[in-house]
């Protein structure tokens, strides 16, 4: 069973991951950035469910074409550069999704814009964060 | 409604000629803004991008140090400054708004003809 | 330079389904636009992300996407859907804008 402070640390790590996530959505989902319009065209997998830390599975194998669209966007958007910032997501994803048991994502049919793609892996650290306060 | 109404194009024997672009309906500044271009009887190339501001400017590599994009927002009014015009440069012209919710162009310029003669 | 790659023409009679072929490396992670230019006119779009509709755009212009190619799908074309039909997307890393050659539908009437 989860100890507090184990789940005191998930929360925390979600909460890392949520803030670099909405980072990046307001970086560049705002008229001042002169290649939202480029960006929008890069096609994102969504996953079919998202409900569990496992399900973020889904989220790191989108982490390359995520760190390609940034790499569009000029770096004073952001604090760090785009392979530091999603270098960082990715140690973050790895430990709250385990490395012990491997997973298999199952993606939607329909494919998303990187802004539909940020709120809907937003919404879903919210809600696990959710559950555990 | 949105409207971008063009003017400036015409006849060149080479030399420079400057287009213009108003824009009516919508937060002028608020959008970065593109030129394409058709030869006759040819497709579509994309030619230049400025940013919301002008701060920022891309181009088409057929272009670069030849073409400059630029913007009054006060105006209202996108321009493009032609120079070195090419015979291969002859086409219409249009403007065209990127859109902030979509991966392309959303409103175009009624276009204008520029015609480069040796 | 990228390319997206297009057939020059397609023929169909009214009421015919006209399909028309994009072609791109890039494809299976960009999305495909589709415009429509009539003779003299500007170009106006269709289609948007491989398969959504403007508004005002009427239901029998649709769109897909599989692996490298996206279609255009025209079911019961009509007289006045006659026009210049343009695939649009962006390269692998989405910094050029790229436009297909063409495809010039002929509606038979």
């Known amino acids: 069973a989860p100890t507090s402070s184990s789940t005191k640390k998930t929360q925390l790590q979600l909460e890392h991951l949520l803030l670099d996530l909405q980072m990046i959505l307001n970086g560049i989902n705002n008229y001042k950035n002169p290649k939202l319009t480029r960006m929008l065209t890069f096609k994102f997998y969504m996953p079919k469910k998202a409900t569990e830390l496992k399900h973020l599975q889904c989220l790191e194998e989108e982490l390359k074409p995520l760190e390609e669209v940034l790499n569009l966007a000029q770096s004073k958007n952001f604090h760090l550069r785009p392979r530091d910032l999603i270098s960082n997501i990715n140690v973050i994803v790895l430990e709250l999704k385990g490395s012990e048991t491997t997973f298999m994502c199952e993606y939607a049919d329909e494919t998303a814009t990187i802004v539909e793609f940020l709120n809907r892996w937003i919404t879903f650290c919210q809600s696990i964060i959710s559950t555990l306060t | 409604q949105v409207q971008l109404v063009q003017s400036g194009g015409g006849w060149q024997p080479g030399r420079s000629l400057r287009l213009s672009c108003a824009a009516s309906g919508f937060t002028f500044s608020n959008y970065a803004m593109n030129w394409v271009r058709q030869a006759p009887g040819k497709g579509l190339e994309w030619v230049t991008l400025?940013?919301?501001?002008?701060?920022?400017?891309y181009y088409a590599d057929s272009v670069k140090g030849r073409f400059t994009t630029s913007r009054d927002n006060s105006k209202n009014t996108l321009y493009l400054q032609m120079n070195s015009l090419r015979a291969e440069d002859t086409a219409v012209y249009y403007c065209?708004?990127?859109?902030?919710?979509?991966?392309?162009?959303?409103?175009w310029g009624q276009g204008t003809m520029v015609t480069v003669s040796s | 330079s990228y390319e997206l790659t297009q057939p020059p023409s397609v023929s169909v009679s009214p009421g015919q389904t006209a399909r028309i072929t994009c072609s791109g490396d890039a494809l299976p992670r960009k999305f495909a636009y589709w415009y429509q230019q009539k003779s003299g006119q500007a170009p106006v779009m269709v289609i948007y992300e491989d398969s959504k509709r403007p508004p005002g755009i009427p239901e029998r212009f649709s769109g897909s996407s599989s692996g490298t190619m996206a279609t255009l799908t025209i079911t019961g074309a009509q007289v006045e859907d006659e026009a210049d039909y343009y695939c649009?997307?962006?390269?692998?890393?989405?910094?050029?804008?790229?436009f297909g050659g063409g495809t010039k539908l002929t509606v038979l009437g």
């Open positions: 400025i940013s919301y501001d002008g701060s920022q400017k």
């Open positions: 649009y997307s962006t390269d692998s890393g989405g910094d050029v804008s790229v």
């Open positions: 065209a708004r990127d859109s902030t919710t979509l991966g392309a162009f959303d409103v």
